[in-house]
Interface confidence: low
């Protein structure tokens, strides 16, 4: 599984993280987890192994099985949302996962991230620095 090393977005804004996986994992459960340690992070939202999107309060997840990419969106960002998160795939044995650092810029601070042309408050990251975990 691959994803961006870090993502940055403004306070009160939203961000989208895209996590890519290899062929064969299409119908597995995908999840988004918070916490510095992989083995103790807390799952915030997950798919049901289908392409049906799921939304929970300020976070949503959607799996595009054709492109083998699942997308996580966090809205209404607060400063204390800044943390280490993980994109993951549930499987028998250890899950697959990759770490994503979420940085939230305080309101009024200049943001260096590229913004989507349709919404100046949303930053989309596919990640130029990709890495594999596990």
């Amino acid at each position: 599984i691959q994803g961006p090393e870090s993502v940055r977005a403004p306070e009160q804004g939203s961000l989208t993280v895209q996590c890519h996986y290899k062929q064969g994992w299409e119908t597995y459960i995908k999840w988004w987890c918070r916490g510095v340690r992989w083995d103790t992070c807390k799952i915030l939202i997950e798919t049901r192994g289908s392409e049906q999107g799921e939304k929970s309060d300020r976070v949503s997840i959607k799996d595009n099985q054709k492109d083998r990419t699942f997308t996580v969106t966090m809205e209404g960002l607060r400063r204390d949302d800044a943390d280490v998160y993980w994109c993951g795939i549930e499987r028998r044995g250890p899950d697959l996962g990759t770490q994503v650092k979420v940085i939230v810029d305080p309101e009024g601070a200049a943001s260096t991230t590229a913004s989507s042309p349709t919404n100046s408050n949303m930053a989309v990251f596919i990640g130029s620095h990709k890495r594999n975990h596990y």
Epitope: R34, D39, L44, M74, D80
Partner: antibody, heavy 126, light 107 residues
Framework: QVQLVQSGAEVKKPGASVKVSCKAS????????VHWVRQAPGQGLEWMGI????????NYAQKFQGRVTMTRDTSTSTVYMELSSLRSEDTAVYYC???????????????????WGQGTTVTVSS | DIQMTQSPSSLSASVGDRVTITCRAS??????LNWYQQKPGKAPKLLIY???TLQSGVPSRFSGSGSGTDFTLTISSLQPEDFATYYC?????????FGQGTKVEIK
Amino acid sequence: QVQLVQSGAEVKKPGASVKVSCKASGYTFTTYAVHWVRQAPGQGLEWMGIVNPNSGGTNYAQKFQGRVTMTRDTSTSTVYMELSSLRSEDTAVYYCARDIVPMNNFYNYYYGMDVWGQGTTVTVSS
Amino acid sequence: DIQMTQSPSSLSASVGDRVTITCRASQSISSYLNWYQQKPGKAPKLLIYATSTLQSGVPSRFSGSGSGTDFTLTISSLQPEDFATYYCQQSYRIPYTFGQGTKVEIK
């Protein structure tokens, strides 16, 4: 003191809906998420879902998806749980319970239930 | 969904006994495990959260341990007011499932 006070017992016919209220006092209503848990007679506890009183955002157990609606009214510090298409298996005591972790500390991060309502008995019978 | 299995489902003990209740999760839940006590006709009461953190006002004779899939609630010296049903609950993954309960009865 911190407390959750629920509405009174209800008797409903199969197919009907029931709406249970849970009024919070003694703390900042919008700071803590509220869970709903039910317990059928002589049975264990079953988690139904959670509502964020600040945003109104919800997350339901798949089992109740499509039948349950959890809402809140910040002006009265009250959360509501409405269950539709009632059947006899829905006969239970329904509890609201406050999450132990203030929501401004974490993002979508629910822990456990430290303050409980007294429970509302819902009986479904023809 | 994550299945939570408690054992035993019931036990008989005397005042002063050391009582241990175990809870097993169908998959790893890290340390996101809570314990509740419920008496007949009453709402549950939180005893321990995050595996081992004692909720405010709960006597120190209650303790919790474990991680991953296996957890334990221990009552070091059973008191008359401890006769009740105990439930474990995981808060790792929605839906936040409970164990089936362990009833602690007087021997």
